[in-house]
Amino acid sequence: ERLPLTPVSLKVSTNSTRQSLHLQWTVHNLPYHQELKMVFQIQISRIETSNVIWVGNYSTTVKWNQVLHWSWESELPLECATHFVRIKSLVDDAKFPEPNFWSNWSSWEEVSVQDSTGQDILFVFPKDKLVEEGTNVTICYVSRNIQNNVSCYLEGKQIHGEQLDPHVTAFNLNSVPFIRNKGTNIYCEASQGNVSEGMKGIVLFVSKVLEEPKDFSCETEDFKTLHCTWDPGTDTALGWSKQPSQSYTLFESFSGEKKLCTHKNWCNWQITQDSQETYNFTLIAENYLRKRSVNILFNLTHRVYLMNPFSVNFENVNATNAIMTWKVHSIRNNFTYLCQIELHGEGKMMQYNVSIKVNGEYFLSELEPATEYMARVRCADASHFWKWSEWSGQNFTTLEAAPSEAPDVWRIVSLEPGNHTVTLFWKPLSKLHANGKILFYNVVVENLDKPSSSELHSIPAPANSTKLILDRCSYQICVIANNSVGASPASVIVISADPENKEVEEERIAGTEGGFSLSWKPQPGDVIGYVVDWCDHTQDVLGDFQWKNVGPNTTSTVISTDAFRPGVRYDFRIYGLSTKRIACLLEKKTGYSQELAPSDNPHVLVDTLTSHSFTLSWKDYSTESQPGFIQGYHVYLKSKARQCHPRFEKAVLSDGSECCKYKIDNPEEKALIVDNLKPESFYEFFITPFTSAGEGPSATFTKVTTPDEHSSM
């Protein structure tokens, strides 16, 4: 006959931090040395035995005299209420045929965590609980005095809960957020009427969720140490030492070795010299609440990240070539390195790849003379490319070479009694053609009428012009640029004995914001090209002199430069260059890139004032030095008369007042007789020039009173 195997000696212990009940019991009457499969049903009640809050089954194999263990976690802090536990059992083993029946319940075991025995009248639980963001948390208060009104607040906002008994109220906080690393504050205040009986707060420590490490990778630079790195993600450390930053551990499964890492995002692993080639690493991130891990499997020889090359040098450097040498840190015998060279200079970048064993060498060719280059090199394992090393670099400068192009030369010839004054100009050679620092220019002047006669003028750089006084002969002038290595090709220009073509008429042109568009008639006969030169009309020609070379088949060009300023007049001359390099003036043009209104008004004199007329004149007014072509003048006249004088028409001034206006369309007409006036009458006048852009500045009117008919002026 079967004995009911009732659970006995039930003991319940608690873990307040984990909010767990731990049950221990034994089963009496179990046959000696026999194992039975059994099911235990456990009941848990809260506050009173009739209030069952949890029922569950626990299946296990039971041995004779065995102490059984089972734990249960409460969502409610154990300090909030008394709990009761009982247990019954059922044999569920094939060795015993049906029917199986449940044993009697054990007696109720009462569990009370007395943390509210102090002098306070209000307690809040749990104290200093650590949870993960997104967790559901239950808190409670225990009030000694049921007459007290208790209000609770989460981060200053009142919360409402469920009363478990007259002394206890519980609050369910769903999916708690991370607010700050020193915790979330919750407090309750007990009061009677308007009198505070006490306040009690707790800190709920909410941790951010531990992330899986990202970008986990290991590599070696010397086959002695593996350097592993990862992105740790969010730091889950909390204040008050409640939870330190997460820890990181490396575990290698083939060797079974483990290492606690001391840095949050990297760890070094010593490679043992036992020829282990394959590594299987697990990186474990861990905090008080959870573990996260990530795995990598790799062959050591496929993860070589070399130290950067060293001893970068340049040998046999000349104007156009150099040999670049470098060394690499030798890490294994018969190791082949792939190296990449980058050459930066003159705004360009070239890239070359080379395979080496120990020392690197590369022949750099087609370099520019007198140029600073930056060359750098990086290397990698040629057999199993993993990643490039860091760059190692050095600057070097190629040697100078003789200038490769003749200077661009032009001239201004001015005729003076008995001679020519030739002002010679040249443009500095570009860096590309100078091939070094230009030290001086040689100007060789050869009299073509007396071939044996020549002069050499040496002009130190950076001068870009010189003045030559020559007699009325024909001259060939050569200009040569020199640096420390040698001389450039010569630039040749011929000055004719004949005077320049003075019959050329000057033509007015209008510029645009883009500059000046010029065209000309082709020069009769053979030409090797055209030259357009220009300068500021009002300035000394040497100050702002420019020129442009144009090909022989071109009869138009656009001169565009940022130097053109609004309101400035520029004079252009177009020359044809004959095969003998003699310049012939073809056309002259003048104009403004943008005309402006006149900057000043003429100084007007009043002449021959009579009782019926007066004469206005402004003979001294210069039309040349104006910010636009003066097209004429506006004469404004005010009088008491309602009607305007003949030739004058009504006009409204900018201030809204009315007057009479007369327009003079000839800029050289600088006088006007105003007649048909009344004696002893008061008149006012004002004269302003105008360009295509408008009138001159507004100014005050000048007052004139005609005398009586008997007066003589």
Epitope: G118, D120, K127
Partner: antibody, heavy 121, light 110 residues
Framework: QVQLVESGGGLVQPGRSLRLSCAAS????????MHWVRQAPGKGLEWVSG????????GYADSVKGRFTISRDNAKNSLYLQMNSLRAEDTALYYC??????????????WGQGTLVTVSS | QPVLTQPPSASGTPGQRVTISCSGS????????VNWYQQLPGTAPKLLIH???QRPSGVPERFSGSKSGTSASLAISGLQSEDEADYYC???????????FGGGTKLTVL
Amino acid sequence: QVQLVESGGGLVQPGRSLRLSCAASGFTFDDYAMHWVRQAPGKGLEWVSGISWNSGSIGYADSVKGRFTISRDNAKNSLYLQMNSLRAEDTALYYCAKDITSSGWYWFDYWGQGTLVTVSS
Amino acid sequence: QPVLTQPPSASGTPGQRVTISCSGSNSNIGSNAVNWYQQLPGTAPKLLIHSHNQRPSGVPERFSGSKSGTSASLAISGLQSEDEADYYCAAWDDSLNGPVFGGGTKLTVL
């Protein structure tokens, strides 16, 4: 009835030491963080140090770090402040204050009457 | 030098409304609760307002607190002669890892 009574103040020479005590009653002492706050004559309040219910977390103002040590004895319901290398600027009325929470970063709902520390040669 | 800034003095006549300001930074008032303490002449400080605007039981409704950004203020309406005292604002400071106080405002009832 919550009571906090400070003692141990007095006149002391610069560079010397002093130990303040605070006897607590009327509440469950080991359930709360405790603090020391001082007030120089005619001046405002300055937090000096704080300690959590189980001494697991301790904090100090920069002005006293390395010189002052806070401690508690929950069995004796007492809070202490060991003050070493005292300076003239430490002269103040030292208050013992009770936090409303165990971890100690809320506010002080009860204060003692203070004990005067005078540092002078 | 106090971390939180208060006006040194304020005054009002009985029945009037008086406001005391307290300005700080992101690391204190900007991210933490503000508390106010009242210190009557010759006595220890007493908690007046906590969590920006919460009055402990027993503190008259005439006292109210508010916070905006990195500033807080204490308002006293219907001023009474017994309100003459020093008022201190306080908040936890995340940078200094401790509570910080204002320099205090002496309120005079005229």
